[in-house]
Every structure is written in C-alpha cells, then in structure tokens.
C-alpha cells in the first residue's frame, strides 16, 4: 500500500503530508528527502498539487467540516515588505527561482514588513477537491515549534528530477512497487522519477510461483530515461494480449503459440523497451506553445522547446513567457518592459543621450528658443526654475509667466504723495493741478495754479530703478525707502518710473482744484480709489490716493 500521497508529472513529484507543524519544520522534512515545500508557479502545477492533496484527503476516514491549511513554499523574509505591484506580492519560492506571474491569493494581504510571512493552501476539508476550483493562497505568520499557526493541518513537498521513466508495463498478473529517491513507495505513479527503484512481483499473489524483478530508472541517453527492461513483464501464454493489452503502449500482436509482440501505429516507432511507442517526429503533435519552436531530440526521441529572443520557457518547459528585462535595470532612468523586449525612457526634464545604452541627459529647458519662462530661466538637473524681473511676480499654473505688480495697490500703502500711475514693471507719480512733482519723483510741491491736467515731473524725470542700476531697489516688504537723497518719510518701496512719453491725462478737471496739502483731495465719484494709510481727511471728503493705469483705465487692476 502507498504510505503517502504522491503525484508525479513533468519533471517533478509532489507529496502531501498531515502534520501540525510550523513552516520551518515542514520545510525541514521536505529538505531531508531532497526537496522543498512545493511551488505553485502555474495553473498546471496548481492542478498537480490539488491532485496530491485530493489523494491525501481521500485516505482520511472522517474529515470534519472545517477549513484546513497546508504549507507551500512561498515565503517573505523578515524585513521584506509586501509589494502590491508584483503577482507574488514580494513573496518568493523557498527553492529560489524567478518571480512567477501565476498567483491565487485568497484575499487582500496584510501589509507588513517586520515579520516573516508564509503561505498555505486553504482547503475546505469537508468538501471534495474539484478540478476547476484550485486551492486559494492564504498568507500569515509562519508559526513556531508547538505553535504552527491557526488551522495548519499539513504541507506539500516538491521534488525535482532531471527526467522521468514511464511506469513499467505488465503483460500479465503482477504487482509493481516503486521506491522513489524521496523515500516514498507507490504502486500507482503515472511517471516515475529518475533513480527510482521498481520491484516487480509477478503472479497472482497467493501462489508460490511469483517471481521478482528489480529495475532502476536510468538515463539511457541525454534526456532519455528508461528501466533497461526489454518487453512486457509478467507475460503468460495463458493471457496473451488479453491482459492489459499485453502491457503494450499501442498495438499488441499475438502469435499462434500464445506469444505476442508490441507494435506501433503509423508515424510511430517502437522503442528499445519493445513496449513503448514514440512519434517518429516527436514534434509532430505540436507540443510547444506560445510561439515556442519544437526541436526534436536525438534519434527522434523526446524534444525540447525553444523560445524566441526576449522570451523564456515557463515551468512547464512547453510555453514561452516574456522575459522582464527591466529586472536587470538596463536603463539609466525608466525601463518599460514590452513583449519580447524593453525600452528605456527618460524622466520629465531629461532626454535620451550621454554615454552608454539607455542613458539620459538633462534637458536644458532654458536653452535659446526653448525657454518656457516669460522672463528669467535657470536650468536645474532634471528641471528648471523661472524668475521674474523686479516689478513682476511669477504667475500662471505652471509658474512660468510673469505678472506685473501693481505698485499703486501694493500692501505697503501709497507709494506717491498724490497720484500713482502703474506701468509695466514699475509705476510713476503725478500731482494735482497747482502742484508739481518734486525732484524725488514722489512728493508734490506747490506750483503755479492751473486748471490743466495733473502735472508730471519736472524735465529731469526719474525712472523706476531696475536690477543693475546704480541705485539698488529696496525690498518690497519694507515701505520706508524713498528715492536716494530724500528723507525716509515717503511711503514708497521703489522709485517711480517718470516718463515724458506717457502723458498724464483723463483726470476730470472739475475735481482737480487743490485743497490743502497735495495728498488730499475730494474723491471723484467715478474713480475706484485706494485708501491712503495715515492721511488726514479734510472736512466733508474722503482721503484717498487715486490710481490710474497706463492703459487709460481707472482704479485698481
């Protein structure tokens, strides 16, 4: 009788075991026999693992209605964080190997980094395992000796081999017992791993005429594995081809004397064991998938699948999957994996160039003809920095535009004693009729009375200061500094721009009669005005500083 549940397929065998053990204890038991806790790297492998668990569950007499968990070889080491961007979420297979695309998580994973975490298969032990419903993966603490973790019932091991032998063919009554390298005995393997021993006991079993034969699964030629036996075993003239088709793989031909021979269908040939048939062209059945090319093995035996460049064989060795070249960080900055290839990209602010494949170099956004800035532009690594000349502030959603500062409505209060005119990047002062602009370009002095428009400055006009001028501009935040050579009493921050080519006009004459000091006058009802801080208010009127923009409109911008 079989001592454990075992399933062999492809180039691996899976065993399932009961035992309330920690993940580390389970891994040690697998390791002792040359294996690891099982991988589940594809749906095909998930089916093999499900089959071995179904075998195990069938042997258990009375299973209660409960959820049970079986360790597999997926773990995340202490200090490695959950990574939601990967199919395995930062977990890796204990035997090593690549990050595989297949996963079957039961639910949202717990977000952690500190603790080691282990994965088990979640089974409803009261239900039969249906082929379409593969066991879900459950993540949790890895347990410790004597404290395996909640609902842990057992574990699944995987043993990998260089190849498999077909089961021995019996042409008459008998019993074959296979002993595998991982110390499991079984009579019902669909594939038998390399280095397994087979004990064949021929006969009905209750008679003394039973004979025993021993065979070893050997590698006869590269990738060719067989038992070294010739012809069906336990043959008896009594049965001929009637027992198990004579043990033949395909056709059985009887001779008249009770002897028989195995044969093959067209397109197949009989192998050296005189039992098994193999395709004359092993690739004729198109075993390779996903763009893989089939390469026949030597002597028309076996085959290998080969993938195009940029792809690699998956765990089944039959299908091609894309190689993620980006794992090797071939690019200086950004790597985009594409089917069969990859491409390098540069971050915003960089462009392809420089030494080496996939290199990136800084884009000089400030270079001639490409500056995004309205005024000043400073290139930085991977970016740029816009700045504005004095009298302007950065504006626009992206901070590349420059907007004129309306000094006449600035936070520092009135800049001019009387009239203030905003200009692009600066401002200038003016006076009411009967007053003239003082040499400081800010104050108004009593002049000859006239009913003309407000007066501009005297001939020697002052311009508002700019960067690089002989008079440094004052900081906007401290409204104490007047034009050089004047007492610091005028509430201005920068010297005004005084320009004769922009005459001061459009102030209604009927409201321009001087009244008291030059900074005090009745508010024209049609003007938007800005209140002057600290000014005295004449009887019957509001005190204000009129503002007028260069475009001829009145008031605040």
């Amino acid at each position: 009788a079989d001592t454990e549940a075992v399933v062999c397929a492809g180039t691996a065998c899976y065993t399932a075991h009961w035992g309330k053990l920690s993940a580390a204890e389970a891994q040690n038991l697998c390791l002792q026999n040359g294996g690891n806790l099982a991988t589940v790297k594809s749906e095909e492998e998930a089916q093999h693992v499900q089959q071995v668990l179904a075998q195990l569950l069938r042997r258990e007499a009375a299973l209660t209605a409960r959820m049970g968990k079986f360790w597999i070889g997926l773990q995340r080491e202490k200090g490695k964080c959950l990574d939601p961007s990967l199919p395995l979420k930062g977990f890796s297979w204990v035997g090593g190997g690549e990050d595989t695309p297949y996963s079957n998580w039961h639910k949202e994973l717990r977000n952690s980094c500190i603790s080691k975490r282990c994965v088990s298969l979640l089974l409803d032990l009261s239900q039969p395992l249906l082929p379409g419903r593969l066991p879900k993966w459950s993540e949790g603490p890895c347990g410790s000796p004597g404290s395996p973790g909640s609902n842990i019932e057992g574990f699944v091991c995987k043993f990998s081999f260089k190849g498999m032998c077909r089961p021995l063919a019996l042409g008459g009554p008998g019993q074959v017992t296979y002993t595998t390298p991982f110390q499991t005995t079984s009579s019902s393997l669909e594939a038998v791993p390399f280095a397994s021993a087979a004990n064949v006991a021929c006969g009905e079993g209750d008679k003394d005429d039973s004979q025993s034969h021993y065979f070893l699964c050997k590698e006869k030629a590269p990738d060719v594995f067989d038992w070294g036996s010739s012809g069906p075993l336990c043959v008896s003239p009594k049965y001929g081809c009637n027992f198990n088709n004579g043990g033949c793989h395909q056709d059985c031909f009887e001779g008249g004397d009770g002897s028989f021979l195995c044969g093959c269908r067209p397109g197949f040939r009989l192998l050296d064991d005189l039992v098994t048939c193999a395709s004359r062209n092993p690739c004729s059945s198109s075993p390779c998938r996903g763009g893989a090319t089939c390469i026949p093995g030597p002597h028309g035996k076996n085959y290998t699948c080969r993938c195009p460049q940029g792809y690699q064989l998956d765990s089944s060795q039959l299908d091609c999957v894309d190689v993620d070249e980006c794992q090797d960080s071939p690019c200086a900055q950004e790597c985009v994996n594409t089917p069969g290839s990859f491409r390098c990209e540069c971050w915003v602010g960089y462009e392809p160039g420089g030494p080496g494949e996939g290199a990136c170099q800084d884009v000089d956004e400030c270079a001639l003809g490409r500056s995004p800035c309205a005024q000043g532009c400073t290139n930085t690594e991977g970016s740029f920095h816009c700045s504005c000349e004095e009298g302007y502030v950065l504006a626009g959603e992206d901070g590349t535009q420059c907007q004129d500062v309306d000094e006449c409505v600035g936070p520092g209060g009135p800049l001019c004693d009387s009239l203030c005119f905003n200009t692009q990047g600066s401002f200038r002062c003016g006076c009411l009729p009967g007053w003239v602009l003082a040499p400081n370009g800010v104050s108004c002095a009593m002049g000859p009375v006239s009913l003309g428009p407000p007066s501009g400055p005297p001939d020697e006009e002052y311009k508002g200061e700019r960067e690089g001028s002989t008079v440094p501009p004052a900081a906007t935040a401290s409204p104490t500094r007047g034009p050089e050579g004047t007492p610091k009493s005028t509430p201005t921050t920068r010297r005004p721009l005084l320009s004769s080519d922009a005459p001061i006009t459009s102030v209604p004459l009927e409201v321009l009669a001087p009244s008291g000091s030059p900074g005090l006058w009745r508010e024209p009802s049609i003007h938007h005005t800005t209140a002057a801080s600290g000014a005295q208010e004449p009887a019957g009127g509001d005190s204000s500083v009129a503002t007028q923009n260069d475009d001829g409109t009145d008031g605040q911008k």
């Epitope: 200090g79 964080c81 980094c113 500190i114």
Partner: antibody
Framework: QVQLVQSGAEVKKPGASVKVSCKAS????????MHWVRQAPGQGLEWMGG????????AYNQNFKGRVTMTTDTSTSTAYMELRSLTSDDTAVYYC?????????????WGQGTSVTVSS | EIVLTQSPSSLSASVGDRVTITCRAS???????LHWYQQKPGKAPKLLIY???NLAFGVPSRFSGSGSGTSYTFTISSLQPEDIATYYC?????????FGSGTKLEIK
C-alpha cells in the same frame, strides 16, 4: 479615522529609563505595525525600530545598542517604547508612527509626539 | 546603512517660485521605498509623497517627486506661504530605515 495618542512629557535623570506609550484607535490594532522615530532638538528624524503587534516580532536600529525595547498590549491597543540608560543625547521628541494602508514604509499616521528631557 | 544627503540644507524662495530639493542616497534605493515628508515647527512630520512620485491623500498637486536609483527630487511648482517647513526624504532598503538630513524652506 486612525489616531495615535501618546503619553505626556517626561523629565528623567541620566542613567534612568523612560517608557512612552502610544494608544491606537480607528483601526484593528494588530493589522498595522507600529514604529518609533525620535527627533533631538534642532536635529533631523531618526528611526528607532518597529513592532508587529500580530506576532510580537521587532526590528530595531542598531544605533540603540540593545537599550530599546518595543512591546504591545493588544487588549488595550497600545504600543510601548522603553529606552534605558538615558543620557543627555536622548533628549528628544519621540513619535509613534505607522503606515496604515500605504506600502513600502511610507509613514502615514503619526502620534503628536512625547517630549523626553534627560537632565541631572 | 544607507545615508541620504539632502541639498540644499536650507533655502529661501519667494511666493510663487518653483522650488526643488534633491535627495541623494549612498547606494541605490528602490523608487517604491523613497518618500517625502513635511514638518512644521512643533508638529509631527506629515507624509507628502510616497514611492517617489505618488501624492499622499489630501496633499495639493503643487507638490511632486521624481527620481530613481541614488538620485531623487522633490518639487513645489509654486511656493505658497503655508509651505514654510522642513522637508525630509526617507528610504527603506533593509533595516534601518533612514531619513535625509532635512531641508529648511523659508520665504524671502
């Protein structure tokens, strides 16, 4: 919403120990790790270590040479950080913090901080 | 341990300016594990950007980040008065987690 409320300011003598608490609310306490970060006056941030309340596993910054112990009490949803053999260099504000539903150790939630002064 | 060096250590900029802070690591850091925090005086740090370029919940879009390997950048596209604070980068690529030395941002 997630809240981390820390114990009050402490004044300790050199050589003494301090135990700072951090009470969590607004989530299942065992779902998120708890970490501790300190900041000396006028200095930057220094990670001290963290604890996984589900398992009790810890990770410590070796700079603290075995002087630090982090524990949790799941019944009260409280994390503790004990620092022993205090010197004046341990004068700092101590923060508990965790990364909630964010990944990769991006610390999304912080306690208000506990000021610890070590002075003779 | 990985050392994070921030530059500049302090900077003064005007409202509306574009501000850039650089964080260099002594060895390569996965972009998923590089984050940026803002800390105002007397307050706990606040997460602004996680995994190099993702905005934390409720953080204004004027904040952004980029980078990979050993060089990461944090940008404020248009500086606001309320952005006055110290900014820290933080990485994890095995214990210990480390923070950058900090960049103190002031308004001109």
């Amino acid at each position: 919403q997630v809240q981390l409320v820390q114990s009050g300011a402490e004044v300790k003598k050199p050589g003494a120990s301090v135990k700072v608490s951090c009470k969590a609310s607004g989530y299942t306490f065992t779902d998120y790790e708890m970490h501790w970060v300190r900041q000396a006056p006028g200095q930057g941030l220094e990670w001290m270590g963290g604890i996984d309340p589900e398992t009790g596993d810890t990770a410590y910054n070796q700079n603290f040479k075995g002087r630090v112990t982090m524990t949790t009490d799941t019944s009260t949803s409280t994390a503790y950080m004990e620092l022993r053999s205090l010197t004046s260099d341990d004068t700092a504000v101590y923060y508990c913090t965790n990364y909630g539903n964010l990944y990769y150790y991006a610390m999304d939630y912080w306690g208000q901080g506990t000021s610890v002064t070590v002075s003779s | 341990e990985i050392v994070l060096t921030q530059s500049p250590s302090s900077l003064s900029a005007s409202v509306g300016d574009r501000v850039t802070i650089t964080c260099r690591a002594s060895s390569s850091v996965s972009s998923s594990y590089l984050h940026w925090y803002q800390q105002k005086p007397g307050k706990a740090p606040k997460l602004l950007i996680y995994s190099t370029s993702n905005l934390a919940f409720g953080v204004p879009s004027r904040f952004s980040g980029s980078g990979s390997g050993t060089s990461y950048t944090f940008t404020i596209s248009s500086l606001q008065p309320e952005d006055i604070a110290t900014y820290y980068c933080q990485q994890y690529s095995g214990y210990p987690l480390t923070f950058g030395s900090g960049t103190k941002l002031e308004i001109k």
